[in-house]
């Protein structure tokens, strides 16, 4: 895949190694940790990003911070198994043979078990609710301006078509962005809502995954929108299977 032509870097993923060894001497980039070739015109899958993040040397892992708001059942970061397309494998296990099932965004959706645990299919996360609290401003943002700006941001920065931004709700200082995407709705080249949400989350935390691009500078009619808290809720096409003791 072609990356940036002039200096052979990957604009959409700084956690890559790039070299001009593609067809015809074109720039090709591979994700750290997995060595999988990535398409630098679009977002890299969250699974490959998480794998790259875990492979980085501890002292060089400038992108990693304690993730106080991550809704991953407090499991935190883990080194995932990805399929050849870069998607999470339905079953994930750690080095101590503890296994669990995940959804398409890599969030655990069952109790933990042993190697005998079966995860029949990768269950799709079809609805993501991004809950933001913005810092105090002189007045509330205009709702329609905020809606338009967030749709533009998700299209231009994360390449997510506005059809997948189902709604933007606003009650100062809380903003809720609803992303919806069924398996059947994804057409060729469409970005996955899970990947868009992950890139957005990292941007909001000041841990941008983009190469050489400035951090997230979100403005609504020139007024800076600064996020001070993020919570992300994931809804799967099939409800999760946790025991009652949870």
């Amino acid at each position: 895949h072609t990356a940036a032509q002039d200096n052979c870097t990957c604009p959409t993923n700084k956690m890559t190694v790039c070299s001009p060894d593609g067809p015809g001497g074109r720039c090709q980039c591979r994700a750290l940790g997995s060595g999988v070739a990535v398409d630098c015109s679009t977002l890299t899958s969250e699974c490959l990003l998480l794998k790259a993040r875990m492979s980085a040397p501890k002292n060089a892992r400038t992108l990693v911070r304690p993730n106080e708001h991550a809704l991953v059942d407090n499991d935190g970061l883990y080194d995932p198994d990805c399929d050849p397309e870069g998607r999470f494998k339905a079953r994930q296990c750690n080095q101590t043979s503890v296994c669990w099932c995940v959804n398409s965004v890599g969030v655990r959706r069952t109790d933990k078990g042993d190697l005998s645990l079966r995860c029949d299919e990768l269950v799709r996360t079809h609805h993501i609710l991004i809950d933001l609290r913005h810092r105090p401003t002189a007045g509330a943002f205009n709702h329609s301006d905020l809606d338009a700006e967030l749709r533009r941001l998700f299209r231009e920065r994360y390449r997510l078509h506005p059809k997948f931004v189902a709604a933007v709700h606003y009650e100062q200082p809380t903003i809720q962005i609803e992303l919806r995407q069924n398996t059947s709705q994804k057409a060729a080249g469409d970005v996955d809502i899970g990947d868009a949400a992950y890139y957005f989350e990292r941007d909001v935390k000041g841990e941008s995954l983009f190469q050489g691009r400035g951090g997230l500078d979100l403005r609504v009619r020139g007024e800076p929108l600064q996020v001070e808290r993020t919570l992300i809720y994931y809804l799967d096409e099939i409800p999760p299977k946790f025991s009652m003791k949870r």
Partner: antibody
Framework: QVQLVQSGAEVKKPGASVKVSCKAS????????MHWVRQAPGQGLEWMGE????????SYNQKFKGRVTITRDTSTSTAYMELSSLRSEDTAVYYC????????????WGQGTLVTVSS | DIQMTQSPSSLSASVGDRVTITCRAS??????LNWYQQKPGKAPKLLIY???RLESGVPSRFSGSGSGTDFTLTISSLQPEDFATYFC??????????FGQGTKLEIK
């Protein structure tokens, strides 16, 4: 091989509506965006709108102010573009084109349908 | 809407010439720029997508470059079948997606 075959030329009177069809073959119809682009005689290309055949979602060029409607019939792998309240400046060749969700590039085009608006 | 401006509007060249057509966007469009070739009475044909990626089956004499607002389409050695009209198109932002006005390449 991928093919987009459009309906034949139309002559319409001002104020009337026209519905152009585009039958797709050679690929999974619901897996690609379908766009409509028009070209007035001797002029450039103008994007009119798009649809995802999987769920009938459409978005449109606001220039057409609600005059354009794009639909599809998945059972026949056919997309349709209807333009209402026709005026003489709508005389153009209308193309359907298969699109890519990320690049928004149009890799296969129909042969075009000439719509003439004349009283 | 993003405006796309091509230059020149027309140009004359000979077989074997190296030809460059430029396209300028009214705002940053990253690399989401596509090029098409159209011959009289025919539908446009995709040549290059995402600034520099050659569409399958397109001869390697066609190449594209640029980023941000300024882009170029280069034909390294003109062939008789290359005389046509060329359009650029952006796919960066929210709809509508917009085209340049076209560059007509004629035989000198």
């Amino acid at each position: 091989q991928v093919q987009l075959v459009q309906s034949g030329a139309e002559v319409k009177k001002p104020g009337a509506s026209v519905k152009v069809s585009c039958k797709a073959s050679g690929y999974t119809f619901t897996s690609y965006w379908m766009h409509w682009v028009r070209q007035a005689p001797g002029q450039g290309l103008e994007w009119m709108g798009e649809i995802t055949p999987s769920d009938n979602y459409g978005s449109y060029n606001q220039k057409f102010k609600g005059r354009v409607t794009i639909t599809r019939d998945t059972s026949t792998s056919t997309a349709y573009m209807e333009l209402s309240s026709l005026r003489s400046e709508d005389t153009a060749v209308y193309y359907c084109a298969r699109g890519h969700g990320n690049y928004v590039s149009f890799d296969y085009w129909g042969q075009g349908t000439l719509v003439t608006v004349s009283s | 809407d993003i405006q796309m401006t091509q230059s020149p509007s027309s140009l004359s060249a000979s077989v074997g010439d190296r030809v460059t057509i430029t396209c300028r966007a009214s705002q940053d469009i990253s690399n989401y720029l596509n090029w098409y070739q159209q011959k009289p009475g025919k539908a446009p044909k995709l040549l290059i997508y995402y600034t520099s990626r050659l569409e399958s089956g397109v001869p390697s004499r066609f190449s594209g470059s640029g980023s941000g607002t300024d882009f170029t389409l280069t034909i390294s050695s003109l062939q008789p079948e290359d005389f046509a009209t060329y359009f650029c198109q952006q796919g960066y932002t929210l709809p509508p997606y917009t085209f340049g006005q076209g560059t007509k390449l004629e035989i000198k």
